[in-house]
């Protein structure tokens, strides 16, 4: 009789352990669901607010036609500047026209004044040709005014209303560019 009671007690204890395990799993699952719910709500809120604002450019970016521009507040070398832009889903500024150049230099005058800003222009070491980072050549009116005498790699930057060249390892501000979001309306 005592053995029977002891066996029943052990079975009950085993059941209790299983139930505790199930409860623990359920709590974990519930926590995971709550976390996912929170994430989904945040995502929905972001989507709705961005749809409501229908802003073609992110906060702190400037819009001009189909482009958004970000003027950095930190200095970095050219290659690090490129990395910083890529992290934002953008590339270093690529100036396609005199109109775009005028907009950029005008905006810089308002924001910061006469500093140096890296753009996505670099000189091919083999040919000495200037190329934008997508591989295209700048239009004749948008070539850096001075040839840098650096033995190192040479990159382009904007200062005041000029396009100039410098050793890519010098520290400057930089400008990123991405396409503006098109309104679906």
């Amino acid at each position: 009789k005592l053995l029977q009671v002891s066996t029943i007690a052990m079975q009950q204890q085993e059941k209790l352990i299983q139930q505790e395990r199930a409860l623990l799993n359920f709590t974990e699952w519930k926590r995971s669901c709550a976390l996912q719910m929170k994430y989904c709500q945040a995502f929905m809120q972001n989507s709705l607010s961005s749809a409501h604002n229908s802003s073609p450019c992110p906060n702190n970016w400037i819009q001009n036609r189909e482009s958004c521009y970000y003027v950095s507040e930190i200095w970095s070398i050219w290659h690090t500047s490129q990395e910083n832009c890529l992290k934002e889903g953008s590339t270093l500024l690529q100036i396609e026209s005199k109109e775009e150049m005028d907009f950029i230099t005008g905006s810089l005058r308002k924001i910061k004044g006469s500093y140096d800003y890296w753009v996505g222009l670099s000189q091919d070491g083999h040919s000495g040709r200037w190329l934008w980072q997508d591989g295209s050549s700048p239009s004749p009116g948008l070539l850096p005014a001075e040839r840098s005498q650096s033995a190192n790699q040479v990159c382009g930057y904007v200062k005041s209303n000029s396009l100039l060249s410098s050793n890519c390892s010098t520290w400057k501000y930089f400008i990123c560019e991405k396409y503006a979001l098109r309104s679906s309306v």
Epitope: Y39, F43, L86, K87, E88, G89, G135, E177, K178, Y179
Partner: nanobody, 121 residues
């Protein structure tokens, strides 16, 4: 777990071509840019080519006109077509994603394990 899986490396003669491919095997909240970097022995890792989520492209100066990057958002892959290969292109090529992880809020760099490209006769 593996997040970025490269394929397509190997030995090729100067002037030859190779195509590298990279597949993303993990979910991200968003991928801002994907691309390829390379590292030759004794040298720093350098950008070869990158493409942003908006389709903007950046190439390393030394590969312009020879390499072409493309991205398939539906398959979450990024390819690098390498033509007119030179001995100085010899390096380990790494796939990279600049992405915001699920439940994250900041962009992080994710790297593949690398694939060797050797250009030699």
């Amino acid at each position: 777990q593996v997040q970025l899986q490269e394929s397509g490396g190997g030995l090729v003669q100067p002037g030859g071509s190779l195509r590298l491919s990279c597949a993303v095997s993990r979910n991200f909240f968003s991928i801002n840019a994907m691309g390829w970097y390379r590292q030759a022995p004794g040298k720093q890792r350098e950008l070869v080519a990158a493409i942003t989520n908006g389709g903007r492209i950046a190439y390393g100066t030394s590969v312009m006109g020879r390499f072409t990057i493309s991205r398939d958002d539906a398959k979450n892959t990024v390819d690098l077509q390498m033509n007119s290969l030179r001995p100085e292109d010899t390096a380990v090529y790494y796939c990279n994603a600049k992405a915001i992880p699920v439940y994250g809020s900041t962009v992080e760099d994710y790297w593949g394990q690398g694939t060797q490209v050797t250009v030699s006769s």
